[in-house]
């Protein structure tokens, strides 16, 4: 039978570490991490790491009992967890019978938004105490709410990942800019900034009709030339406070009728750290 892996949590040092080993298996040939989505009961989905590793093809894999994988996550707080993946059979060949290196994977480490992860792996038995053993590590940075997968997470939806404010902004005259945007039931308070290298105007927008989408309009006084300036719309939603996803537009000249014209180049960007 071909070896498979059985993985389980192992937070402390492996028991083999306390033993003296004359010989140890070689290091891993490759270690990779990618995010995968899994459905959860709440109708949302969670993002997990798919950690896959490749064994070096030589006789030292005959000594291999397990591979230990540890993940450190750094964002607002630090997390640390390890799993030990035991091989169910001894290796009878250095490569798979069908060809190619022995490759295994573990899916289980949860992924939070916008977090840097350090993933380390080593084979067991590993080096003796006070000796450096062969190990391999990779970094993985999880995406934020603008990511095509992450934006559908409930946490991101509540932070406005699916909201398109469809901003239009035009210069009415030398002193004012008219900004129009579609509101969202996620919140009722917004900040509109006009920037042309520096901030030349801003306004708080309070939209009382929170439960339905409406088109809001605000006229903002400006202190400099506004044509070609950037409009940044920052929403304040309960779930993300001042760190909600910001949207951008560009100020153009208002048509003679006074109706602002729609823009194609609406852009979104996260405000600081995204939830």
């Amino acid at each position: 039978r071909e070896p498979t892996v059985q993985c389980g949590s192992e937070t402390g040092p492996s028991p083999e570490w306390m033993l003296q080993h004359d010989l140890i298996p070689g290091d891993l040939r490759d270690l990779r991490v990618e995010p995968v989505t899994t459905s959860v009961a709440t109708g949302d989905y969670s993002i997990l790491m798919n950690v896959s590793w490749v064994l070096r093809a030589d006789a030292s894999i005959r000594l291999l009992k397990a591979t230990k994988i540890c993940v450190t996550g750094k964002s607002n707080f630090q997390s640390y967890s390890c799993v030990r993946c035991n091989y169910t059979e001894a290796f009878q060949t250095q490569t798979r019978p069908s060809g190619g290196k022995w490759t295994f994977s573990y899916i289980g480490f949860p992924v939070e938004l916008n977090t840097v992860y350090f993933i380390g792996a080593h084979n067991i038995p590993n080096a003796n105490m006070n000796e450096d053993g062969p190990s391999m590590s990779v970094n993985f940075t999880s995406p934020g709410c603008l990511d095509h997968i992450m934006k559908y997470k409930k946490k991101c939806v509540k932070a406005g990942s699916l909201w398109d404010p469809n901003i239009t902004a035009c210069k009415k005259n030398e002193e004012t800019v008219e900004v129009n945007f579609t509101t969202t039931p996620l919140g009722n308070r917004y900040m509109a900034l006009i920037q042309h290298s520096t901030i030349i105007g801003f306004s708080q927008v309070f939209e009382p009709h929170q439960k339905k989408q409406t088109r809001a309009s605000v006229v903002i006084p400006v202190t400099g030339d506004s044509e070609g300036a950037t409009v940044q719309l920052t929403p304040y939603f309960p779930t993300c406070g001042s760190d909600c996803i910001r949207h951008k537009g560009t100020v153009v000249l208002c048509p003679q009728t006074g109706v602002p014209f729609p823009l194609d180049n609406n852009k979104s960007k996260p405000g600081g750290w995204l939830p």
């Epitope: 010989l23 030589d58 030292s60 005959r62 000594l63 019978p97 069908s98 060809g99 190619g100 290196k101």
Partner: antibody, heavy 118, light 107 residues
């Protein structure tokens, strides 16, 4: 029946290159590493390197690293060994040898004599 | 690199003799050892792998033993076709090295 059939003898001048082929049959080519071993006249065996036909991973004996190139063509189940900047002491019989489950050499080609002479 | 030292480099024996060849590795190779037989003008032929396992078609008069760094090839009753050169080889990770060879000649 597993067979490894090598290309014919070569005579080369110092500084030239030689490319030896090893055509295999009777097994799944991508499932086993292919090794190259040489034997100078009246001397012992010397491992030069190995290639995994599955993904072309190569490991060389440091002694030959700068001069030897191992390749393979999976479409014709053939491995190749090219040795460059030949010297007179490269005169030897060159063997391809297929690994077993680990790197014991279960099957060997018939050998290719490469003579380097000015 | 692991060095493989074979002894003797040559020996003379008669048909029916018991012949022993030894091979010493410069470090523990964890029984990852093979033995080959080579006749003049021919490619080497695998005799044993993993110290004790006979390759296909190899007569049972050939046997191997040993562990760690010291290994032995024994031919229990030498036959005319056994006069050849014998090599040990470790496969405990590249680079693989061979012993210098033992030439078994007719006494």
């Amino acid at each position: 029946e597993v067979q490894l059939v090598q290309s014919g003898a070569e005579v080369k001048k110092p500084g030239a290159s030689v490319k030896v082929s090893c055509k295999t049959s009777g097994y799944t080519f991508i499932s086993y590493w292919m090794n190259w071993v040489r034997q100078a006249p009246g001397q012992g065996l010397e491992w030069m390197g190995r290639i995994d036909p599955y993904d072309s991973e190569i490991q060389y004996n440091q002694k030959f690293k700068d001069r030897v190139t191992l390749t393979r063509d999976t479409s014709i189940s053939t491995a190749y060994m090219e040795l460059s900047r030949l010297r007179s002491d490269d005169t030897a019989v060159y063997y391809c040898a297929r690994s077993g489950g680990f790197d014991w050499f279960a099957y060997w080609g018939q050998g290719t004599l490469v003579t380097v002479s000015s | 690199d692991i060095q493989m030292t074979q002894s003797p480099s040559s020996l003379s024996a008669s048909v029916g003799d018991r012949v022993t060849i030894t091979c010493r590795a410069s470090e523990n190779i964890n029984s990852n050892l093979a033995w080959y037989q080579q006749k003049p003008g021919k490619a080497p032929k695998l005799l044993l792998y993993d110290v004790t396992n006979l390759a296909d078609g190899v007569p049972s008069r050939f046997s191997g033993s040993g562990s760690g760094t010291d290994y032995t090839l024994t031919i229990s009753s030498l036959q005319p076709e056994d006069f050849a050169t014998y090599y040990c080889q470790h496969f405990w990770g590249p680079p693989y090295t061979f012993g210098g060879g033992t030439k078994v000649e007719i006494k």
